[in-house]
Interface confidence: low
């Protein structure tokens, strides 16, 4: 079935060292759990995190990302999850693509985060 | 405004091959794939790949059809071998990316592919 991919519709902002969580849902809601969901950057398409067949693809993630991320699952039956990263670092600022596939149909939505420097208040 | 230019449809015989490929211009992609929708059905993912390289098929079409993508000219090419009437379809290739700081989808006016028997 056909559906939508929706981000948070305003910018994601986090402090540098700490842990940013960007969201991304389908509509209508409906258990994404057998979807391929993916996270990469804009405009080149590094694989941020990538959950395939039940799993996370590790294998597949950009070596900046590596260790730092975790999908948050817990609402992944109702077709929402969220990216964490961990330990933010200035340059994870910028455009993130979120997707989901089902079978043959895929679609994606923007997700922007802003850093900011926690010494400079 | 991206602009779409589609070319490489027509008529082939089952079997046969068939290349499209899809120019897009104004920005750089994030993906490109194309798209097709036969007469009462849904439009459906045929292949479709970010411009990091990574690609996604339709089981339909695997083994078959090959995609690939040029991000610096912005160009994607569908390479369709073995085709079969259920192939039959118009094909549109489809940009997404960020255009003028703005996430934006595009779509192209659609190339027709009709397998013969």
């Known amino acids: 079935g056909q559906f939508r991919v929706i981000g948070p519709g305003h910018p994601i902002r986090a402090l540098v060292g700490d842990e940013a969580e960007l969201p991304c849902r389908i509509s209508p809601g409906k258990n994404a759990t057998g979807m391929e969901v993916g996270w990469y950057r804009s405009p080149f398409s590094r694989v941020v995190h990538l959950y395939r067949n039940g799993k996370d693809q590790d294998a597949e993630q950009a070596p900046e990302y590596r260790g730092r991320t975790e999908l948050l699952k817990e609402s992944i039956g109702e077709g929402k999850v969220a990216l964490r990263i961990q330990n933010v670092r200035f340059s994870d600022e910028g455009g993130y693509t979120c997707f989901f596939r089902d079978h043959s149909y895929q679609e994606e939505a923007a997700v922007e985060l802003k850093v900011e420097d926690p010494f400079y208040w | 405004q991206v602009q779409l230019v589609e070319s490489g449809g027509g008529l082939v015989q089952t079997g046969g091959s068939l290349r499209l490929s899809c120019a897009a211009s104004?920005?750089?992609?994030?993906?490109m794939g194309w798209f097709r929708q036969a007469p009462g059905n849904q439009r459906e993912l045929v292949a479709i790949?970010?411009?990091?390289?990574?690609?996604n098929y339709a089981d339909s079409v695997k083994g078959r059809f090959t995609i690939s993508g040029d991000n610096v000219k912005n160009t994607v090419t569908l390479q369709m071998n073995s085709l079969n009437p259920e192939d039959t379809a118009v094909y549109y290739c489809?940009?997404?990316?960020?255009?003028?700081?703005?996430?934006?989808?595009?779509w192209g006016q659609g190339t027709q592919v009709t397998v013969s028997s």
């Open positions: 489809r940009f997404t990316g960020w255009v003028k700081s703005s996430f934006s989808t595009y």
């Open positions: 104004g920005s750089m992609f994030s993906t």
């Open positions: 790949m970010s411009s990091g390289g990574t690609a």
